[in-house]
Interface confidence: low
């Protein structure tokens, strides 16, 4: 028996295509590129029907439906714009991912353009089906310092000019150290900030001496020391990592990393600092910030900063030789021979940064570590040298500039 003539579906074809079909003849229905066979609400690549003994087809011809890539995946710290009218997500439609500028930028300067493929997947020429990555922009504060030739004896920092500074605070709100934001979920600070004072009789660092992640919190976007700030973000701590070669007696490798429980929202008041690209030049001017003690042993109301020069390593070693204190290669010194400008108690772990004038970007040089009293003549502030431990920092955090 002969079966009725078949019409191929719109955007599809029938194979084999012949004038007449008889009992037991089979037909394969397929669709054009970018379309799928739709039968009983089920999508498939092909559909087969057969001419039956009674001269009818075993099934109705299915329809061809355009492939739909559906809503594209959300991009963390990014936005999606549709290039097609009516926000179409069907075959050959185009979308563009972009990052939340100016606080995030796309890794490898990817175009961010994705096209809906015939397979129903959003595809990028370089990344394939993988989403792009929005990386935090580092060291580019929205508010720049009013340039002054020098800062004498420290001065209050202008709000928003040090957006990478972190306050390490006890849960009752009492600050105890500083730190710097790296990437979107790490704080670099001093290792000595993360443990109790050791017993001078037995100065061995034990696990029980370490602060637990739940003993303190991180506050970003902070300006005032104790007063609340509408820009501040309070973040829990997931994990702490002290440098494996940290020596609490000599302060060698006095650096630690704090992983945040959640990522802060980057904005004009919260932005990471860049890791150093190379070694620091002696004589270069650096800025040190913190909420630590000032002269007269008073704590300031707001964030303070000082501008001081990097000091030659051998000069610093000689200054501390009479005190039998070692200034090792993982340390960097800064300050002025006459004294008067220095970090002090409570500044520990806080940032020492320098401006790369060509790029207009700020880089982390060191973290406040130790010294002989504060601001003493012929004594310099000693900082943990970030360049020396950059590989370790990058290995633990995965942060790249």
């Amino acid at each position: 028996n002969e079966c009725p003539e078949l019409q191929p579906p719109v955007h599809g074809k029938i194979e084999p295509s012949q004038a007449k079909y008889f009992f037991k003849d089979q037909v394969l229905v397929s669709c054009d590129t970018g379309y799928k066979v739709l039968k009983d609400n089920v999508e498939m690549d092909t559909f087969q029907i057969e001419c039956l003994k009674d001269g009818t087809w075993s099934n109705k011809i299915p329809t061809c439906k355009i492939v739909d890539c559906r809503a594209p995946g959300e991009l963390e710290h990014g936005l999606i714009t549709f290039s097609t009218r009516n926000n179409l997500t069907t075959y050959k439609s185009e979308i563009k991912y972009s990052c939340q500028e100016p606080y995030y930028k796309m890794l490898n300067n990817n175009t961010g353009i994705y096209t809906c493929s015939a397979q129903g997947v959003w595809m990028n020429k370089v990344l394939g089906r993988s989403l792009p990555t929005c990386l935090p922009v580092c060291g580019l504060p929205k508010f720049s310092r009013k340039l002054m030739a020098r800062i004498f004896n420290g001065r209050p920092a202008q709000k928003g000019t040090t957006p990478w500074i972190a306050m390490l605070s006890h849960l009752n709100g009492q600050p105890f150290c500083g730190g710097s934001l790296l990437g979107s979920s790490w704080i670099v600070t001093a290792a000595h900030c993360l443990h109790q004072s050791l017993d001078p009789e037995d100065p061995t660092l034990r696990d029980s001496d370490l602060l637990s992640p739940s003993d303190f919190k991180i506050i970003l976007g902070k300006h005032w020391r104790l007063r609340s700030d509408e820009n501040e973000q309070h973040l829990g701590v997931k994990h702490t990592t002290l440098h494996p070669q940290y020596d609490p007696n000599t302060f060698e490798n006095d650096v630690a990393l704090v992983e945040l429980l959640e990522s802060p929202v980057l904005n004009a008041f919260v932005m990471p600092i860049c890791l150093p690209e190379g070694p620091q030049q002696e004589g270069a001017m650096v800025i040190v910030s913190g909420w630590g003690k000032q002269f007269l042993q008073r704590f300031p109301e707001t964030l303070m900063e000082i501008e001081i020069p990097i000091v030659d390593h051998s000069t610093c070693q000689k200054a501390y030789a009479p005190l039998k204190k070692k200034v090792t290669r993982d340390m960097i010194c800064a300050g002025e021979k006459e004294g008067g400008k220095d970090a002090c108690a409570g500044d520990s772990g806080g940032p020492m940064v320098t401006l790369n004038r060509e790029r207009g970007q700020w880089y982390l040089v060191g973290t406040v570590s130790w010294g002989d009293d504060c601001g003493k003549k012929d004594r310099y502030g000693v900082y943990s040298y970030i360049h020396h431990n950059k590989d370790w920092i990058q290995r633990v955090t995965g942060v790249r500039n």
């Epitope: 849960l171 009492q174 637990s212 739940s214 003993d215 303190f216 829990g236 959640e262």
Partner: antibody, heavy 119, light 111 residues
Framework: SVEESGGRLVTPGTPLTLTCTAS????????IHWVRQAPGEGLEWIGY??????VTWYASWVKGRFTISKTSTTVDLKMTSLTTEDTATYFC????????????????WGPGTLVTVSS | DIVMTQTPSSVSAAVGGTVTIKCQAS??????SAWYQQKPGQRPKLMIY???TLASGVPSRFSGSGSGTEYTLTISGVQCDDAATYYC?????????????FGGGTKVEIK
């Protein structure tokens, strides 16, 4: 160990103070939580105090009716405006790790003290 | 406050079988969750903290997993002694506040 005391039968509106007594550890090094359990029901968190600093936090449903405070070796839970809904066994519990609030769970629980609010 | 939604409310298992209890937090609480066991007329006992760390003295057949908003307690090779009600708890710190909310509990019966 920790042990609660002070639970009894009271009429609605009567204030009541429960006491949590610690022994074998320095209460100042730990956060002490109060948790309650109505008959046949689940556990309900009330709040906590970190004794060294005196910092307290409460569940939002407490709405100022309960206050947690401390002495040198005890932590008190002062309860006001009691209703029949507050009938429960009240537990105090210590966090596993010392040094402030620790997200290490409550490792040391008292046997509980029963508070019955009835007219 | 954070809401901890625990499922199922009750479960029955044969000795040697596996029990899985889930807890969903209403917001990301990182690894700040704990699990407790409570037998009738007894005080609760800490089983798991930090989402996956086994508390001291807890048999290794108990395990915890998850982070963010989804947490799971698994009892592999269930014993008669495991019949109890199990509770999840948030131990979350954020923005100067602490949350210790418990889930509604799961009653485990052994067949």
């Amino acid at each position: 160990s920790v042990e609660e005391s002070g639970g009894r039968l009271v009429t609605p509106g009567t204030p009541l103070t429960l006491t949590c007594t610690a022994s074998g550890f320095d209460i100042n090094n730990y956060a002490i939580h109060w948790v309650r359990q109505a008959p046949g029901e689940g556990l309900e968190w009330i709040g906590y105090i970190y004794a060294r600093s005196g910092v307290t936090w409460y569940a939002s449903w407490v709405k100022g009716r309960f206050t947690i405070s401390k002495t040198s070796t005890t932590v008190d839970l002062k309860m006001t405006s009691l209703t029949t809904e507050d009938t429960a066994t009240y537990f105090c519990a210590r966090v596993l790790a010392g040094g402030g609030y620790a997200n290490t769970g409550l490792s040391l629980w008292g046997p509980g003290t029963l508070v019955t609010v009835s007219s | 406050d954070i809401v901890m939604t625990q499922t199922p409310s009750s479960v029955s298992a044969a000795v040697g079988g596996t029990v899985t209890i889930k807890c969903q937090a209403s917001q990301n609480i990182g690894y700040s969750s704990a699990w407790y066991q409570q037998k009738p007329g007894q005080r609760p006992k800490l089983m798991i903290y930090g989402a996956s760390t086994l508390a001291s003295g807890v048999p290794s057949r108990f395990s915890g997993s998850g982070s963010g908003t989804e947490y799971t307690l698994t009892i592999s090779g269930v014993q008669c002694d495991d019949a109890a009600t199990y509770y999840c708890q948030s131990n979350y710190i954020s923005s100067g506040s602490v949350d210790g909310t418990f889930g509604g509990g799961t009653k485990v019966e052994i067949k």
